[in-house]
Amino acid sequence: APRQRQSTLVLFPGDLKTNLTDRQLAEDYLYRYGYTRVAEMHGDSKSLGPALLLLQKQLSLPQTGELDSATLKAMRTPRCGVPDLGRFQTFEGDLKWHHHNITYWIQNYSEDLPRAVIEDAFARAFALWSAVTPLTFTRVYSRDADIVIQFGVAEHGDGYPFDGKDGLLAHAFPPGPGIQGDAHFDDDELWSLGKGVVVPTKFGNADGAACHFPFTFEGRSYSACTTDGRSDGVPWCSTTANYDTDRRFGFCPSERLYTQDGNADGKPCQFPFIFQGQSYSACTTDGRSDGYRWCATTANYDQDKLYGFCPTRADSTVIGGNSAGELCVFPFTFLGKEYSTCTSEGRGDGRLWCATTSNFDRDKKWGFCPDQGYSLFLVAAHEFGHALGLDHTSVPEALMYPMYRFTEEPPLHKDDVNGIQYLYGSRPEPEPRPPTTTTPQPTAPPTVCPTGPPTVRPSDRPTAGPTGPPSAGPTGPPTAGPSTTTTVPLNPVDDACNVNIFDAITEIGNQLYLFKDGRYWRFSERRGSRLQGPFLIADTWPALPRKLDSAFEEPLSKKLFFFSGRQVWVYTGSSVLGPRRLDKLGLGADVAQVTGALRRGGKMLLFSGRRFWRFDVKAQMVDPRSASEVDRMFPGVPLDTHDVFQYQEKAYFCQDRFYWRVSSQSGVNQVDQVGYVTYDILQCPED
């Protein structure tokens, strides 16, 4: 039989190998996380045995008292920096908040994730705790906040330094004044949502979705954006696991697409360009002391003085090695062979790496490619537990277990809920509601709704994919016709409180209308009736489909606009105009649905995915030049809201069962509450 090819192992310059012995690692760990001090108090300072037993008990490991492989593995697992036994130090007060409206301030950001993703991760992490307690969490913009959130490296202003990549991920302090209550995240980590770097795309046909790493293209696996398959050098990625089958793609941040800041209005780099008489064919840090990469946006900087900063590429910014922070260069030569994606060749540990020049053999410049990263949402949810007064648990499945473990399951365990409810109690039961009426008698004027399923269709934008135009996807199953019966037997599905996600929510005549599968409910805080319904959409607005994406009432004319898929209906009283295609409103073919609307200064804003437009109700046209990114005007709301509506002069952005409420003060929009649609808006009782 042919011999298996031996992989050549190479000594990589700057590859940091820890020189700590197992015993040194154990001593350091046991001291840092409070085990040695507790063991010493019980009179044994020479042997590690008692401290190891404490650790094994606390972390639910086999209690051998030995430095065995399971214990060493646990000690090498990334974790929270808060000690397991005892505390960092003595703290002031009884270590719980004595008010329920907790405020938080995001003092700074990591560059690993877009700001909106960071804000969303924190908001979702707080929402976990507010869902099971009477606590609410409001984002504020000053250090007077109860919880200050900070990304820092090494010594970062609290006397408890971070330790570089991996190891200690974050720490937080128990409730109280000053540093107490604050949560700090190690910015030497790669922060992600737990499944690799988050690279939002532009253009292409995936409506700004993030890259999916790794992805398959022409049978090869890619863990970073690539220029393969294109002749223009613009990096792209697939937004699903397999481009070959799904053909969904977008372009990655690139100086060939745009630049940031500077003075060139975001124009792309011009390569080559002249700077101080020299020619540059790539972004450079020359002429700057801060290490920021820049380029000229005309052929001659010396003459035109026009420049911009090159977008950072999280997917190919290397970690460690001897070129930390630099970009992978593809293709690169290694041992005489060319590589156009990260590789583990030459390494015994299987870690992916790349060269940061075109030739590793010559320059020996390299770094590790980004790994899966740590989920900022999960780590934040854990740290916020500390900021609310929780200690570590010994239940390995619980969120408050000290070790990091990625999961896509709901992270709160019964143990976490018991702990937080011991401190603050459970969510208060709303006052009892009268029974919902079963014979609907709609009193509101009818409104308009769309007629197709809200499946997002592929964009018809003419930008070709890396290997040709994307193939059009299915347009979704046909919607069922409207039901003809008007009364429905009492049934759990008739209770709006049992609806997980509504199709559409809108305010009509000071009442909230909630639509789901051909039916709707009305809710009013001001009237004794609270929730009424369900009513049949077909009885009130016969022209509408069962499934709506969004709706709004124009306050002056009282016209009701209903959207479904690529269609819109406009009801004035009981007369209807439509269905009309969204094109008639000036929305391009790449807008697959309208997901919501808000009133702003005499005009409406129409939302679709991550974008919105100004809509002139009189003219029934959007201003095509008004297209804007949601996260620019509404920082901190989720990037993938399925419904946007206005209620009592505040904007609500819905994602899953949650809403993000946005208030506007002197032109500044800020999230002031995150909660459940059912519990917090409809005041449903909890199970």
């Epitope: 130090q89 003092q107 006397g159 000053g178 290490g291």
Partner: antibody, heavy 115, light 107 residues
Framework: QVQLKESGPGLVAPSQSLSITCTVS????????VHWVRQPPGKGLEWLGV???????NYNSALMSRLSISKDDSKSQVFLKMNSLQTDDTAIYYC?????????WGQGTSVTVSS | DIVMTQSHKFMSTSVGDRVSITCKAS??????VAWYQQKTGQSPKLLIY???YRNTGVPDRFTGSGSGTDFTFTISSVQAEDLAVYFC?????????FGGGTKLEIK
């Protein structure tokens, strides 16, 4: 309300050591770090060092060998000790509470190094 | 150590004018810059923290901006009582360091 008050010797002979106490009220040393800053006559501010809530310290690298900061949480006092003073150590010495900036300062204590 | 450079030791302005003081860090300090005002014979007073946040009670004519290495402190309409020395300081990494100060003089 928050207050910090430095008390020092005023006059120190060259090569002698300096001890200054900063007594704080209105907040706990368990919740806020305290920094020391000095200002020579007619000059700018020079950061000396900090003691964090847990007792960890960081120092100005140029002065590290002669500087030591400690505290007594129960008495709400922070101590600055500096050895081998020379005439260019003449300055007003301030303690300041820290929380994303030094938000409260003492009135300062004037130290003159002279024989 | 990180060096904070305030390029102007003195700036002369008139009441009602807008004035901007710059501060440059020798390396990236993110947004961890504070600005202090020190009037003759007084202790410094924190005006701006984290580059752009006004401290409680500070008039809104005082603003700060910047991130990375370049920071600006602005008084939108100078008042007579703004006569003072203004210092920037980085608190990104110890040792924390101050700029040399800019003395604002009123014409």
């Amino acid at each position: 309300q928050v207050q910090l008050k430095e008390s020092g010797p005023g006059l120190v002979a060259p090569s002698q050591s300096l001890s200054i106490t900063c007594t704080v009220s209105g907040f706990s040393l368990l919740s806020y770090g305290v920094h020391w800053v000095r200002q020579p006559p007619g000059k700018g501010l020079e950061w000396l060092g900090v003691i964090w809530t847990g007792g960890t310290t960081n120092y100005n690298s140029a002065l590290m060998s002669r500087l030591s900061i400690s505290k007594d949480d129960s008495k709400s006092q922070v101590f600055l000790k500096m050895n081998s003073l020379q005439t260019d150590d003449t300055a007003i010495y301030y303690c300041a509470r820290y929380y994303y900036g030094m938000d409260y300062w003492g009135q300062g204590t004037s130290v003159t190094v002279s024989s | 150590d990180i060096v904070m450079t305030q390029s102007h030791k003195f700036m002369s302005t008139s009441v009602g004018d807008r004035v901007s003081i710059t501060c440059k860090a020798s390396q990236d300090v993110r947004n961890t810059v504070a600005w202090y005002q020190q009037k003759t014979g007084q202790s410094p007073k924190l005006l701006i923290y984290s580059s752009s946040y006004r401290n409680t009670g500070v008039p809104d004519r005082f603003t700060g901006s910047g991130s990375g290495t370049d920071f600006t402190f602005t008084i939108s309409s100078v008042q007579a009582e703004d006569l003072a020395v203004y210092f920037c300081q980085q608190h990104y990494i110890t040792p924390y360091t101050f700029g040399g100060g800019t003395k604002l003089e009123i014409k």
